[in-house]
Interface confidence: medium
């Protein structure tokens, strides 16, 4: 049914879905705090622009009786139930913030006639790509794939002189929501990553992974996995690893590698860590003081979602344009706005762009060092350390196939 939007006459409301099933196990109170901090900033910005309007948020809570797994497995129906709740109450804001689970976002997008923008902190899966009114404020799987293909093909750097065309992917089904969809994208036979690689095999058992580490008949020297160093240690332990194995550890939402007192454990020496360039520490943040790095990113995405709405509202009001139109719903893309701790760029499809950082462990200092950065917006790699102190022979990344000469 057609739901009237509380979105005119100088009063603009944001509907925030507070779902029990979430991409990250974050107390809803922290997300509320992030939203409220965002609202304060938006009100200030609108006032500074001479726009005397009211902006509020309505938090829509799930009853939690049926959908109580806490993770994303039972989120599909929860999202639709919340939309039904909004519909029954005849109370929809100008914009919908949430959900974060790929399943629920996909289903909500599919099952509703969306004439309003949807902003998500999550929805990492490929099934949420290219959605006309969906904006994603945490790096989706597509961005990861494009980095990996770009890096695999690179062969003109002092530390990487071989193109790669093969990989193992370790995926055992216990991953966090972000990792699940990142690895799912790499596994999918029709994905860009699979299309560009000549050989790719998914390892699903711990033993399969462990055997590959010293298997002379392995088909690739490169293994991609997703999680933190502790996750890798649980799996790998102190097992011997062949000298030309390269493990790519995808750990995007983790700032710990950049902390001063962090020393890389010995088991990380064969590992390249892919993470995101951390947030701007120059701005003290009241909402994130007590959050872990991952949770900070999640709460920050909620806050930035509010700031994005404020940015678009300001533009439309200054131009005298109507907010409850398809034009507004489709406008949340191909732009840069003032985020909480710096500029946030959205691509043509409303997905956040970011700087990814590839780290290695220095054999000299046992510290994580930056090997290269990658700008997802321009699909471009910037080499940083031209003489890395690698564990690999000649301080160069090995070929992906043992015994194959230069190409």
């Amino acid at each position: 049914s057609q739901v009237s939007q509380n979105c005119h006459n100088g009063s603009y409301e944001i509907s925030v879905l507070m779902m029990g099933n979430s991409a990250f196990a974050e107390p809803l109170k922290n997300l509320e705090d992030a939203v409220n901090e965002g609202l304060e900033i938006v009100r200030g910005r609108l006032q500074n622009a001479g726009l005397n309007v009211t902006v509020n948020a309505t938090f829509m809570y799930s009853d939690g009786l049926i959908h109580n797994s806490g993770d994303c497995r039972s989120s599909t129906c929860e999202g639709l139930d919340l939309l039904r709740k909004i519909s029954n109450a005849q109370r929809m804001g100008c914009v919908l913030i949430g959900p974060s689970c790929t399943y629920s976002t996909f289903q909500m997008y599919l099952d509703t006639e969306l004439s309003y923008p949807m902003i998500s902190a999550g929805s990492f899966g490929l099934s949420c790509d290219y959605k006309e009114t969906l904006t994603r404020l945490m790096s989706p799987a597509r961005k990861l794939m494009y980095f990996l293909v770009n890096f695999w093909k690179t062969n003109d750097l002092p530390f990487k002189t071989y193109s790669w065309s093969t990989s193992y992917v370790y995926k055992n089904g216990t991953e966090t929501e972000d990792c699940f969809w990142y690895l799912n994208a790499l596994e999918a036979s029709v994905s860009y990553f699979s299309h560009e690689l000549g050989f790719k095999v998914v390892l699903r058992q711990d033993k399969e992974f462990q055997d590959i580490l010293m298997d002379h008949n392995r088909k690739s020297n490169v293994i991609i996995m997703c999680g933190g160093p502790e996750f890798l240690y649980k799996l790998k332990g102190d097992r011997a690893v062949a000298e030309d194995i390269v493990i790519i550890l995808v750990d995007l939402f983790n700032d710990q590698y950049f902390e001063d007192n962090v020393t890389a454990p010995d088991y990380m020496k064969n590992v390249l860590v892919l993470t995101l360039s951390p947030g701007n520490s120059l701005l003290n943040s009241s909402f994130s003081r007590n959050l872990s790095p991952t949770k900070r990113d999640f709460a920050l995405a909620y806050l930035n979602g509010i700031l994005l709405f404020g940015h678009m509202l300001k533009i439309f009001l200054e131009n005298g344009e109507n907010i409850t139109t398809p034009k507004f719903a489709h406008a949340f893309r191909n732009l840069t706005f003032e985020g909480y701790d710096g500029p946030v760029t959205l691509d043509d499809w409303g997905d956040v762009d970011s700087t990814m950082v590839l780290l290695y462990t220095s054999v000299d200092t046992k510290k994580y060092k930056v090997l290269l950065t990658y700008d997802t917006h321009v699909n471009k790699t910037y080499p940083v350390d031209m003489s890395p102190t690698f564990t690999w022979k000649n301080s160069k990344l090995p070929n992906d196939i043992t015994g194959r000469g230069p190409q």
Epitope: D255, L282, T355, V370, T373, V384
Partner: nanobody, 115 residues
Framework: AVQLVESGGGMVQPGGSLRLSCAAS????????MTWVRQAPGKGAEWVSA????????YYTDSVKGRFTISRDNAKNTLYLQMNSLKPADTAKYYC????????RGQGTQVTVSS
């Protein structure tokens, strides 16, 4: 040791120009996106401008667009902020910084715009 040292601030009349510099040492400067942040007396810090690690993408807060230009020279480990058409509202202490938590900002350089 990691260091960021800002310079180039001063007192200038409205409509005047200044060029701020930020010399970085002790870390791989070319690896990181860099930002300029400012703080006016009694106010919170606000970011002014940012530039990506390669130097080919720049951003500005609305109030300085068209007046300020951020740039970097990775060979010299230096970040710049060219400020034109300065206004009294630009009066603040300006800090450069990376987006990496362990690299604390420098001492800052004071910019005062007054007639």
């Amino acid at each position: 040791a990691v260091q960021l040292v800002e310079s180039g601030g001063g007192m200038v009349q409205p409509g005047g120009s200044l060029r701020l510099s930020c010399a970085a040492s002790g870390f791989t400067f070319g690896a990181y996106d860099m930002t300029w942040v400012r703080q006016a007396p009694g106010k919170g810090a606000e970011w002014v401008s940012a530039i990506n690690s390669g130097g080919d993408r720049t951003y500005y807060t609305d109030s300085v667009k068209g007046r300020f230009t951020i740039s970097r020279d990775n060979a010299k480990n230096t970040l710049y902020l060219q400020m034109n058409s300065l206004k009294p509202a630009d009066t603040a202490k300006y800090y450069c910084g990376t987006k990496i938590p362990q690299f604390l900002r420098g001492q800052g350089t004071q910019v005062t715009v007054s007639s």
